[in-house]
Amino acid sequence: EVEKTACPSGKKAPEIDESLIFYKKWELEACVDAALLATQMDRVNAIPFTYEQLDVLKHKLDELYPQGYPESVIQHLGYLFLKMSPEDIRKWNVTSLETLKALLEVNKGHEMSPQVATLIDRFVKGRGQLDKDTLDTLTAFYPGYLCSLSPEELSSVPPSSIWAVRPQDLDTCDPRQLDVLYPKARLAFQNMNGSEYFVKIQSFLGGAPTEDLKALSQQNVSMDLATFMKLRTDAVLPLTVAEVQKLLGPHVEGLKAEERHRPVRDWILRQRQDDLDTLGLGLQG
C-alpha cells in the first residue's frame, strides 16, 4: 500500500502521458487523478510503465471502483489486465465481445491463465450460453478451449454454435465430451449432403453410436484411420467387416499397421477369420 502524500507543486498530471514514467510510485499515487486515469486508460498501453508503476495505477482504479470496474475501463485495460486477480475479475460485468477480444489479445500466445479463465467464465455466464460468435473468438485464441469444459458446461452449447468449431478445437476432447457434442453437431449439419456432411461431422465422430457409423458406411465416406481410431470402442465392435471396409474405403489397408491398437485390436478379435481374409491384409483374428 502506498502512503497518502501530497502532490508536489507543479507535478499534478493534467493528462496521462509519457512524462509519468519519470514519476516515483508515491508521486503517481499523489499526482494522478483516478477519474482522469479511468477516462484515459487507452493511453496507458502506449507508455512503458514499470510493473511497480502499473501496481499503483491499478490501486487507484481499485479505489475509484471498489465494486468492480465499468466496461468502459475494462475494455482499455491492456497490459494492466495482467495485474488483475481472479477476485478482481469476478466483480466485473463484461458483456461486449470487443472487450473480451481486447483482453484475450493481451494474453495471446500464453497458456490460459486463471485470470483469463475467470474472465471467460464471467462473460459466458453473462450471455447465458456459448453462442457462435463467442465460441469463434475463444477457439481462435485457445484452440483447446472447448475441451476444457465439462460435459455439463458443454450441454449449454446450442447446436448453432457448432458451426464455429474447427477440427483442431476437438483434439483434446475426451469421449464424454464428444458424447455431448456429437448430437449437437448431427443436428447442426443435418441439412448438408453426404460428402459435405461427413467433412463437417468427422471430428465429432468420437461420440457417434454404432447405428450412425453403420449409416455412414453406406455413403462412400472413406474415413481416415486417425478418425476411425478415435471412435468409441463400444460403437466400433458391432460393425461387420463389410461395414468397416465400406466406412474406411481405401484407408482400410492401414488396419494392418494399427492392429495392436484399440479399437482396431478389439474389433479384429471379434471377427470371423474368413471375413477378415476378405480385407486382403493378412489380419489374424
Epitope: 486417425a226 494392418k256 499397421a257 494399427e258 486382403g280
Partner: antibody, heavy 115, light 113 residues
Amino acid sequence: QVQLQQPGTELVTPGASVKLSCKASGYSFTSYWMHWVKQRPGQGLEWIGNINPSNGDTFYNEKFKNKATLTVDKSSSTAYMQLSSLTSEDSAVYYCARGWLRDYWGQGTTLTVSS
Amino acid sequence: DIVMTQSPSSLAVSVGQKVTMSCKSSQSLLNSSSQKNYLAWYQQKPGQSPKLLVYFASTKDSGVPDRFIGSGSGTDFTLTINSVQAEDLADYFCQQHYTTPYTFGGGTKLEIK
C-alpha cells in the same frame, strides 16, 4: 524373397489402350494390396490407385479415374493396370508397389505413347 | 488433397558430410491414437525404382543403414543422412499415407561433390 516383375517397355500409339502387368512372388499375394504409381521423366511421383487382391476392390486418385482400371488375377498372382485413350501425357514410368507402406516396388514399365 | 513440400530441391555434399532434407505437409499426419505419423521416405537411385527407407516418420525399414534417420511429427519432417556415402547419390521423396489420394513431395536430389 519378395519380387514384383514388370515388363521393361511398352510402345503404343495415341488413342490406343495398354494393359501393364505386375507379377508378384515371394509372399502371399492376397495379404497385401497393390498400388500403382506414375513417374514422368524428371518429375515426381503420383499415386494412381490401389486394389485389394483378395476381393478386387479398387480405389483411384480422382485424377486417374477415367484413365486407369486396376484388376488382379489371383491364380497367377498378377496385378494389372489398363490405361485407355492414351496421349503423350501418359508417357511415363509406371510402378506397381506392395502394400500401404509401399515396401517393395517393381522395376517399372516405361510407357511411350507415340505415333 | 494433402500437399507435400520438400526442400531443398537439390544439394551437393562431400562424402562423410552430414545432410538434412525437409518435408512439410499441408495438414497434420499424426494419428494421435497410436502416436504414429503416416509419413514415409523413399530413396530412388538413378535408373532404379524407389526403395522404402523410413516409415511412420522415424522407423527404419529393414536393411537400411543406421546413417539414415527420420524425424519430425505433425506437419514438419526431416531426413538426416549422417556421414554421406557415394552410394547415397539419389533422389529422396517423402510421401503421406494419411489420406487418399496419397501424395508425394517433389523430391530432393542429392549429389556428391
